[in-house]
Structure formats: structure tokens, C-alpha cells
């Protein structure tokens, strides 16, 4: 796999173990927690992200309306099972025998059940509204300026194709970003939405996942955006299942 | 196979404007993004801005601002830049670049744009 | 704006040589873009993510560096070689050029 051959490291995540024992001297980096090779050419899936950060030391942490079947990420971090090609396994389960089904961001999508519970397939998040709240301004942002910024950024930093940014909405201070990426239009290396959403959360937080890359320094004709609040709302291809005691609580 | 084949050569006078087109094939033109550059005579390259063909949201550089309109007709798969208020500085071969993941991958084959009284 | 500035400017040199052209930014940047360019054609990527090498492009070119440092390398220089090279940043608005390195026969 790619990496920097000078130094052996990881340009596209900082979670991995790297050493010169691929095919004839190769730089070959492994996921901290999986132990699982990773593509250092693009971003690393946020199955194994999700399980390097837990095996980590704990110091080391017009406007769209979502719809009714949005779904936002309130469970927090918990050590998932990947496939062998670094995906969320349907079904997820906690040491004490609590399972339940998430999407392919890995969020919860039913409620949760014990190891009788069946996932017959990963869903898709095939939507993602990313809302965020910029601090105050001396005065509201140039839209066009502002919406082109952005998908520069989602474009070269996340190598997310351009057709999956389906829009940017500006009502300030709040900014949407609409991602969007059916499964018949994902073709063989292309960047996942949830991966790249994943990415630019962890910018915003300041706990850029790049190895050697300054943090995310977002500028608007050289004006400063700054992040105050975000919230991701995730949408599946098939609508989550949950009980009506969770949905009238 | 991927063309961007651009109009031909222009002659202006000073204070005219001109308008040069590129029109795709061998690709979903709304799914990418087509900039433009120049490049002078006997000089280096220059980017003038870029235009995302899907929402058509636009970015132009700031020393055009003003003077530069990217327009794109998804009918045709045609891009458009027009720059207004010429003068003989803006003498070039003017290129169209398609964009992706990649800041240009193909380019337009350019247009020279002369600009003399 | 990103200043690249390139070393040197021209160059001169036979068919065979190794030849290095560098790319100095004013700021870091993440990845560095090169282009080939010959007369009268428009230019063609030749690097990507400072170094890999674009479709087609013949592994006797390669890049590297990180940061604001930028390397473009030729192991054997070959006839169809002779052109002009850019590098080109994309890591800010506006996008910025080298001022491009004109490589001559010798």
C-alpha cells in the first residue's frame, strides 16, 4: 500500500503502525486496534478509525430539515466489529451481550436486543447533513464563496468526488452540507461519504486524523471560519427500525 | 474518451469582451467541475477560477473578479468563461481543465484570445 | 495566496542525465501537482499527491517532498522529455502555479 517511502508513515491516518515489510521494502502501515493493513492513498474506513481510537490511550479523544428517519450519532464511541475489508458489521454487540444493528456509519438503527438479534444486511447511509454553526462574523459570509470553499475542501483534503456533494446551505451562522452517495453510484475507489464526514468531524474537533498535515485551517477569501457547533444527521437507504417508547421519549 | 474541445481564436479590441466555450464528452458532465487558466505568451499559468457544473456554484480568483462570468449550459455540456473590459495584458491562450479529486486531469486544447487596437 | 516558487528556471541538459526540479511554497501545502508541457500543447498531469504517477506517465518520473519542499525527478532523460514543467497547489483558493521550469537539449 501507499505510503511516504521516505520515512514510513501514514499520510492519511496517524492511528497506524507502519514499517518497510510490504513486497520488496514497501512501507506497509496496520491500523492501530485491528492490526489490519490500510490504503495510506485514501482515507482509512471509520470501522477501523472507530476501533484504533478505543485501543488508544483515553487522554486521546436555506437550511435543510432532517427528516423524521435522520439519525444522529447519541451512543458516542463504542469498540466495533469490522469486516475484513474495514466496514461495520451489521450487527454490533458490547461485552455484556447487548447487540443491536447499525448503518454503514456504524450508528444504531434499532433498539437494542440480546445475541438473538438478527442484522440481515448493512444498510446504507446513502444522506448525510453535516450542520454546523459558525462563530460570529463581522458579517455574514459570501455564499457562493463559502458553498465553492467547501467543496474544495471535501474535494482535496478528503478526495471526495465533487458529484457527492449534493449542496451547501447558508442561513448564517448556520452552514448545511449535504452529502450524498446512493450505493448504485459509489464506484470502486471512490471516498464514502461516512468516511469523509467522519474526517472533517474530527477537523472540527481539532483531532485531525492526517499524519503531518497541519490542522483544518478553513478560510474564506482569507476570513477565518470557525466552528462553534455540529451535528450530523445520518439518512439510510432503508428506514430505522425503532420502538415506539424510544420515538415518543 | 474524455475531450473538452474548446471554440476557436479571437481577436478583440480593447474594452470588448469575449466569451470561449468547451464543450465536454465522454463523461456525466454535472458530476465534475471545469476551471479555467491562461497562459501569456512565452509565460507561465495562470488560474482564473472554476465552476462545480452540478449546483454550478463558482469561484473566481480575485484579480478577475468582476471582469470574469463562468456560465455552463448542461443541455449541451458546454462551459462558458467570458471576460469583459479586455485589454491587450489579457492577450493568452485561454485553457478549460476538468476537475475532480484532481484539480485538472484533462485539459480543452486552448484559445487564443488577442487583444490589439 | 500560496507563492510556489521553482528551481531553476531553465535547465540544460543531455539525453540520459538525471535531473531534479524543486518547488518551494510560501506556506505548507498538503500535496504538490506537476505538469508537463510541450509548444503550442496544452499541459498534461504528470504527478499527483506529490508522487504518484498520473496514467500513462513513465516510471522514470517521480516526486516527493511534504510541507512547503517539492521534488520532481527524471532518472533518465529522454528525448520526448524536453518540455516545460509546472507544480501546482490546490490546498488554498486561488489555486497557484510554479513559474515553470523550461528543460533544454544540451
Known amino acids: 500500500h501507499t505510503a511516504a517511502q521516505d520515512n514510513c508513515t501514514c499520510p492519511t491516518n496517524k492511528m497506524t503502525v507502519c514499517s518497510p515489510d510490504g513486497p520488496g521494502g514497501r512501507c506497509q502501515c496496520r491500523a492501530l486496534g485491528s492490526g489490519m493493513a490500510v490504503d495510506c492513498s485514501t482515507l482509512t474506513s471509520k470501522c477501523l478509525l472507530l476501533k484504533a481510537r478505543m485501543s488508544a490511550p483515553k487522554n486521546a479523544r436555506t437550511l435543510v430539515r432532517p427528516s423524521e428517519h435522520a439519525l444522529v450519532d447519541n451512543d458516542g464511541l463504542y469498540d466495533p466489529d469490522c469486516d475484513p475489508e474495514g466496514r461495520f458489521k451489521a450487527r454490533q454487540c458490547n461485552q455484556t451481550s447487548v447487540c443491536w444493528c447499525v448503518n454503514s456509519v456504524g450508528v444504531r438503527r434499532t433498539d437494542k436486543g440480546d445475541l438473538s438479534l438478527r442484522c440481515d444486511e448493512l444498510v446504507r447511509t446513502h444522506h448525510i447533513l453535516i450542520d454546523l454553526r459558525h462563530r460570529p462574523t463581522a458579517g455574514a459570509f459570501n455564499h457562493s464563496d463559502l458553498d465553492a470553499e467547501l467543496r474544495r475542501l471535501f474535494r482535496e483534503r478528503y478526495r471526495l468526488h465533487p458529484k457527492f456533494v449534493a449542496a451547501v446551505h447558508y442561513e448564517q451562522p448556520t452552514i448545511q452540507i449535504e452529502l450524498r452517495q446512493n450505493t448504485s453510484q459509489k464506484a470502486a475507489g471512490d471516498v464514502d461519504i461516512g468516511d469523509a464526514a467522519y474526517y472533517f468531524e474530527r477537523d472540527i474537533k481539532g483531532e485531525s486524523l492526517f499524519q503531518g498535515r497541519g490542522g483544518l485551517d478553513l478560510r474564506v477569501r482569507g476570513e477565518p471560519l470557525q466552528v462553534e457547533r455540529t451535528l450530523i444527521y445520518y439518512l439510510d437507504e432503508i428506514p430505522p427500525k425503532f420502538s415506539m417508547k424510544r420515538l415518543t421519549a | 474518451e474524455v475531450q473538452l474541445v474548446q471554440s476557436g481564436p479571437e481577436v478583440k479590441k480593447p474594452g470588448a469582451s469575449v466569451k470561449v466555450s468547451c464543450k465536454a464528452s465522454?463523461?456525466?458532465?454535472?458530476?465534475?467541475?471545469i476551471g479555467w487558466v491562461r497562459q501569456a505568451p512565452g509565460q507561465g499559468l495562470e488560474w482564473i477560477g472554476e465552476?462545480?457544473?452540478?449546483?454550478?456554484?463558482?469561484y473566481y480568483a480575485e484579480k478577475f473578479k468582476g471582469r470574469v462570468t463562468m456560465t455552463a449550459d448542461t443541455s449541451t455540456s458546454t462551459a462558458y468563461m467570458e471576460l469583459s473590459s479586455l485589454r491587450s495584458e489579457d492577450t493568452a491562450v485561454y485553457y478549460c481543465?476538468?476537475?475532480?479529486?484532481?484539480?485538472?486531469?484533462?485539459w480543452g486544447q486552448g484559445t487564443l484570445v488577442t487583444v490589439s487596437s | 495566496d500560496i507563492q510556489l516558487t521553482q528551481s531553476p528556471s531553465s535547465l540544460s541538459a543531455s539525453v540520459g542525465d538525471r535531473v531534479t526540479i524543486t518547488c518551494s511554497a510560501s506556506?505548507?501545502?498538503?500535496?504538490m501537482y506537476w505538469y508537463q508541457q510541450k509548444p503550442g500543447k496544452a499541459p498534461k498531469l504528470l504527478i499527483y499527491?506529490?508522487?504518484t504517477l498520473a496514467s500513462g506517465v513513465p516510471s522514470r518520473f517521480s516526486g516527493s517532498g511534504s510541507g512547503t519542499d517539492f521534488t520532481l525527478t527524471i532518472s533518465s532523460l529522454q528525448p520526448e522529455d524536453f518540455a516545460t514543467y509546472y507544480c501546482?497547489?490546490?490546498?488554498?483558493?486561488?489555486?497557484?502555479f510554479g513559474q515553470g521550469t523550461k528543460l533544454e537539449i544540451k
Open positions: 481543465a476538468r476537475g475532480s479529486i484532481f484539480p485538472f486531469d484533462y
Open positions: 506556506s505548507s501545502v498538503s500535496y
Open positions: 501546482q497547489q490546490w490546498s488554498s483558493y486561488p489555486y497557484t
Open positions: 499527491d506529490t508522487s
Open positions: 465522454g463523461f456525466t458532465f454535472t458530476d465534475y467541475v
Open positions: 465552476i462545480y457544473l452540478g449546483s454550478g456554484t463558482i
